[in-house]
């Protein structure tokens, strides 16, 4: 007889996720001679420990604790590039701009980065079928804790000038339910974090107006403000130039506003 | 730069109480999960007691229901309360203070010699 599966409404565990885990975190400590002396194996062991066997609708940031001990990492406080519904650009960029950092080129975002997962409560399986979707099932499940936790420690890490880009193309540039605006924004520490400069990003090849003076940039701006952190906000009308500015800051045509 | 200064170590005899204290400067302290542990000669640095960010403690099974960590971030001060201490509680007792993505901090020592 086929033992009773809770159905989730999200999609499952990402197919290989426990050899996908592993090979990134031998592919990252390979790559960063910082991060050597990690034991990929103990990674998994508490990566996998954080869900397997528990209810994933009752995951805490205790659990990963174990996780994060072991990707503990050093980054530059004042290097730090937080992003909003604009993934790709932001990795992009550091990818090119190598002394800046975005979560996922963190030894723990890059592990977790586009993967799913979650287990059975008193089960040592991984659920492959269906995990819970954060607004239909429930919001303390394995991978949102884990997002969760680790973005609000990357913004407490913050210093100085923060940096933070934003998707243009969007209804809402800023939107205070994106992980950006509801745990993001309100633990970068005001004692280190002297501004937050925003990046809004254009979508259209003709696309000239001023979206810094969008409703919701004002909205970000008086968060900001009220915790006593500097905003300044700039308009970045050309996303491929200002990469290619990026690789080449001394072309002729990187002069002009980008 | 950062530094974890512990106090409050000392003698006492079997059943006798002892509060160490570690204050904390160069780090924004409540951000930081931290923790007491200890190091008896010959062997290995152990987890006493640990309080994170939020507030949640966890213990030795060792010295549970005798010692209580806790911290007051105002001060930018952790506390370990031990109470009915005994001779295996006898070592160097460190203040340690972690963040994920700020690396990993630990003071100099505070000696604790219990006697029967």
């Known amino acids: 007889v086929p033992r009773w599966r809770q159905q989730w409404s999200g999609p499952g565990t990402t197919k290989r996720f426990p050899e996908t885990v592993l090979a990134r975190c031998v592919k990252y400590t390979e790559i960063h001679p910082e991060m050597r002396h990690v034991d990929c194996q103990s990674v998994w062991d508490a990566f996998k420990g954080a869900f397997i066997s528990k209810h994933p609708c009752n995951i805490t940031e205790e659990d990963y604790q174990p996780l994060m001990k072991l990707g503990t990492q050093t980054v530059p406080c004042n290097k730090i590039l937080l992003w909003s519904r604009i993934k790709d650009l932001a990795h992009q960029f550091t990818q090119v701009q190598r002394d800046m950092f975005t979560l996922e080129d963190t030894l723990l975002g890059y592990l977790a980065d586009d993967l799913t997962w979650c287990g059975e409560f008193n089960t040592s399986k991984i659920n492959y079928q269906s995990c819970p979707d954060w607004r239909k099932d429930c919001s303390n499940n394995p991978v949102s804790v884990f997002w969760k936790t680790v973005s609000r420690r990357f913004a407490e890490a913050a210093c100085d000038v923060v940096h933070v880009m934003l998707n243009g193309s969007r209804s809402k540039i800023f939107d205070k339910n994106s992980t950006f605006g509801s745990v993001e924004v309100h633990n970068l520490q005001p004692e280190k974090v002297q501004t937050l400069e925003a990046w809004v990003i254009h979508g259209g090849r003709e696309d000239s107006r001023d979206l810094c003076q969008d409703p919701t940039i004002k909205e970000l701006e008086s968060i900001i403000s009220k915790r006593n952190i500097q905003f300044s906000c700039k308009n970045i009308y050309r996303p491929d130039k200002f990469l290619q500015c990026v690789k080449n800051p001394e072309d002729s045509s990187c002069t002009s506003e980008i | 730069q950062v530094q974890l200064q512990e106090s409050g170590g000392g003698l006492v005899q079997a059943g006798g109480s002892l509060r160490l204290s570690c204050a904390a400067s160069?780090?924004?302290?409540?951000?930081?999960?931290m923790g007491w542990y200890r190091q008896a000669p010959g062997k290995q640095r152990e987890l006493v007691a640990a309080?994170?960010?939020?507030?949640?403690?966890n213990y030795a099974d060792s010295v549970k229901g005798r010692f209580t960590i806790s911290r007051d971030n105002a001060k930018s001060m952790v506390y370990l309360q031990m109470n009915s201490l005994k001779p295996e509680d006898t070592a160097v007792y460190y203040c340690n203070a972690w963040h994920v993505f700020r690396g990993n901090y630990w003071g100099q020592g505070t000696q604790v010699t219990v006697s029967s």
């Open positions: 309080i994170t960010s939020g507030g949640s403690t």
């Open positions: 160069g780090i924004i302290l409540r951000i930081y999960d």
